[in-house]
């Protein structure tokens, strides 16, 4: 990093790779929680028109699909994979695709996915064929 660009102590806005190059942040769909019509489909589009620059370069894209007796919602955000989200670890943060995995939540059906390519939480995938381990 050139000397005129200050590197702040304990600053997570400036994330560098092993070569000292600064990482670009992720671009993610970011509509927070919205009502959704996505149900019983192999995959869905988020219908979120807002693509945001994630605040910190280490953040990834996240989508959370929830269904209860009253409604279905889809949440799209950026989040740091080192921190839990809705009390769950983002296990699949390095994936280029947002492959939904069911999580146990009382009183509702709860699926969550995370991914690390631009706007990858725009297309959320429920299909079982993606959830099996890929030998490649």
């Amino acid at each position: 990093i050139p000397p005129h660009v200050q590197k702040s102590v304990n600053n997570d806005m400036m994330v560098t790779d092993n070569n000292g190059a600064v990482k670009f942040p992720q671009l993610c769909k970011f509509c927070d929680v919205r009502f959704s019509t996505c149900d019983n489909q192999k995959s869905c589009l988020s219908n979120c028109s807002i693509t945001s620059i994630c605040e910190k370069p280490q953040e990834v894209c996240v989508a959370v699909w929830r269904k209860n007796d009253e409604n279905i919602t889809l949440e799209t955000v950026c989040h740091d994979p080192k921190l839990p989200y809705h009390d769950f670890i983002l296990e699949d943060a390095a994936s280029p695709k947002c492959i939904m995995k069911e999580k146990k939540k009382p009183g509702e059906t709860f699926f969550m996915c995370s991914c690390s390519s631009d706007e990858c939480n725009d297309n959320i995938i429920f299909s079982e064929e993606y959830n099996t381990s890929n030998p490649d």
Partner: nanobody, 124 residues
Framework: EVQLLESGGGLVQPGGSLRLSCAAS???????RMWWVRQAPGKGLEWVS?????????YYANSVKGRFTISRDNSKNTLYLQMNSLRAEDTAVYYC?????????????????WGQGTLVTVSS
């Protein structure tokens, strides 16, 4: 190689406007996603805005949405940032950066050149 030179900064009162420019030398400007990045005194980098090379789709940080507008003129190899309704917290050195193309956009900043940036001070 694309080299970058920022200009247009200065002192402006809160609520005022400024337009920053980033002049790129080199013939490959049209291949790059371009960014504006800022660094406030004693703080880290904040990624402000980005624009695609083709179609010119734009992206903004939540902190500047609705106030800043990024644009580019590929025929002039120039990137712009129109900043309106400026606030004290917008005070920073503003840099432009290029993001290399690829199958998916490279996530590391190719630091082959940094300009000195341009200082924006918002104060009454």
């Amino acid at each position: 190689e694309v080299q970058l030179l920022e200009s247009g900064g200065g002192l402006v009162q809160p609520g005022g406007s400024l337009r920053l420019s980033c002049a790129a030398s080199g013939s490959t400007f049209t291949e790059y996603r371009m960014w504006w990045v800022r660094q406030a005194p004693g703080k880290g980098l904040e990624w402000v805005s980005a624009i695609e090379p083709i179609g010119h789709r734009t992206y903004y940080a939540n902190s500047v949405k609705g106030r800043f507008t990024i644009s580019r003129d590929n025929s002039k190899n120039t990137l712009y940032l129109q900043m309106n309704s400026l606030r004290a917290e917008d005070t920073a050195v503003y840099y432009c950066a290029k993001q290399a193309p690829g199958e998916k956009w490279a996530r590391r900043w190719d630091l082959d050149y940094w300009g000195q940036g341009t200082l924006v001070t918002v104060s009454s």
